[in-house]
Amino acid sequence: MSANATLKPLCPILEQMSRLQSHSNTSIRYIDHAAVLLHGLASLLGLVENGVILFVVGCRMRQTVVTTWVLHLALSDLLASASLPFFTYFLAVGHSWELGTTFCKLHSSIFFLNMFASGFLLSAISLDRCLQVVRPVWAQNHRTVAAAHKVCLVLWALAVLNTVPYFVFRDTISRLDGRIMCYYNVLLLNPGPDRDATCNSRQVALAVSKFLLAFLVPLAIIASSHAAVSLRLQHRGRRRPGRFVRLVAAVVAAFALCWGPYHVFSLLEARAHANPGLRPLVWRGLPFVTSLAFFNSVANPVLYVLTCPDMLRKLRRSLRTVLESVLVDDSELGGAGSSRRRRTSSTARSASPLALCSRPEEPRGPARLLGWLLGSCAASPQTGPLNRALSSTSS
């Protein structure tokens, strides 16, 4: 290299990461093998579980607002699960990204898209539940499957928008030991007049914005919605939470537990720009917490099934029946203060009595897409006891 050849500018933390060399330590190799095995298994499980959830919820169940939320959550998780095999490959080849810069950007973007989509969708689910209880009349008139799909599309658009910086600033960086990193390079685009200042401000901006938008704000919305619902239900004298409430609680808890550590380390990483002493902690911890965040996509489908109160009995029946019993709106199970007659009419507004793929009206948006993707959905759906009951009452 000539004396005046300008090297690719890297932030100090990134350059130091590029200097880290691999160990040939036997115990570390065993950990690597275990990690590959674990991620491989998670990839397989995630794809199968979320695929099954999408198929069952999208094609074998009567569409409600609740199933719409779950459908989109499962779609987000399926995307994340689909990217896991490539992360597994990265681990298998010795923590080196051999799939090129474009795929590095795409792969990472899926991770962040899932992060934002999950946070936004869980917020929407909580707000939906809150509106049902706090504004029941408004919910009865406006809470439709079509509206829920529209909300989901807006949330997906917001998630994509928030993912753009992570796509732009993702890059492949050659390490000094020959391996390739797929990581943030915030100096990739318009580094500005001062790289130190740019590194610091952009790293902090990315870490803080994703912490706020994908974690803190959704959790605040979820917590305040839950508080509002609890207060209202206390006045109505209802004690036992509905099945859907338990499902949401489990999914939110999993979200907080899986994504919380990731955001903590992400903020530490931003702080490590000015405090190099934090860097070793970040380098050791970040791979683990990133994997934990990925595993959230594998955990969710399990939670959809496990939160069913009489799980063991219902697991003997079809998976569809289990899910159907879990994913019924509280309003459809006779929330406090609602009569059977009113419940029937609201059900007619918020859901078609037939399953997604054989509804008389043409399915819209993601539902149509799923119907097309899953050709077998064209078959007439099995009708569960709940569906039969609702079909007879709302016809």
């Epitope: 004396a3 300008t6 350059e15 790289r195 002493g277």
Partner: antibody, heavy 118, light 107 residues
Framework: EVQLVESGGGLVQPGGSLRLSCAAS????????MSWVRQAPGKGLEWVAR????????DYPGTVEGRFTISRDNSKNTLYLQMNSLRAEDTAVYYC???????????WGQGTLVTVSS | DIQMTQSPSSLSASVGDRVTITCRAS??????LAWYQQKPGKAPKLVVY???QLADGVPSRFSGSGSGTDYTLTISSLQPEDFATYYC?????????FGQGTKVEIK
């Protein structure tokens, strides 16, 4: 060809001040981080100050913090070291050095001697 | 501050000899180490950066190795132009300190 030429050294009394300059040529000065390194007569090397490529960030060791100030003028391709409250132990040859990336000094000037004595 | 301890402080060797200079940091510096060569009355010259990477224009007889706290500069076959003082320097956490130097003299 990369060139770094220091100037401004000389004899100064304890407590006095001095401003060193380093004229850079042969490379895009505004792209590189820069440092000052000194070497007392017959002794080892000591890093004195660092400045980011745009001049927003500076770093110093405790021995000179508060007394020395590093700055740069990218339009003039010049690096500066303002030395105040000079002590006898500041006597040394002062080198300006270019950072290869964020670290590692790949090019050095020939040095300028600063003598602090009464 | 991180202390850098170089050993030996001086050594005598002949042309063609294999020479090894070690540098020990008081804490892990994660390969953030450079080696410099300085001849009398001259400015230092970068030999190795990032512990193992040879700087531009440096002959392949020079090599750097090590990890954690212990690092080594090796000259596989000493040449007349290699007689000089060698310094290690860490770039982990400021202040970036140098070793006290190793003077390689002709035997």
């Amino acid at each position: 060809e990369v060139q770094l030429v220091e100037s401004g050294g000389g004899l100064v009394q304890p407590g006095g001040s001095l401003r060193l300059s380093c004229a850079a040529s042969g490379f895009t000065f505004s792209f590189y981080l820069m440092s000052w390194v000194r070497q007392a007569p017959g002794k080892g090397l000591e890093w004195v100050a660092r400045i980011s490529n745009g001049g927003s960030t500076t770093d110093y060791p405790g021995t000179v913090e508060g007394r020395f100030t590093i700055s740069r003028d990218n339009s003039k391709n010049t690096l500066y070291l303002q030395m105040n409250s000079l002590r006898a132990e500041d006597t040394a040859v002062y080198y300006c050095a270019r950072h290869r990336t964020n670290w590692d000094f790949d090019y050095w000037g020939q040095g300028t001697l600063v003598t602090v004595s009464s | 501050d991180i202390q850098m301890t170089q050993s030996p402080s001086s050594l005598s060797a002949s042309v063609g000899d294999r020479v090894t200079i070690t540098c020990r940091a008081s804490e892990n510096i994660y390969w953030n180490l450079a080696w410099y060569q300085q001849k009398p009355g001259k400015a230092p010259k970068l030999v190795v950066y990032a512990a193992t990477q040879l700087a531009d224009g440096v002959p392949s007889r020079f090599s750097g190795s090590g990890s954690g706290t212990d690092y080594t500069l090796t000259i596989s076959s000493l040449q007349p132009e290699d007689f000089a003082t060698y310094y290690c320097q860490h770039f982990w956490i400021t202040p970036w300190t140098f070793g006290q130097g190793t003077k390689v003299e002709i035997k």
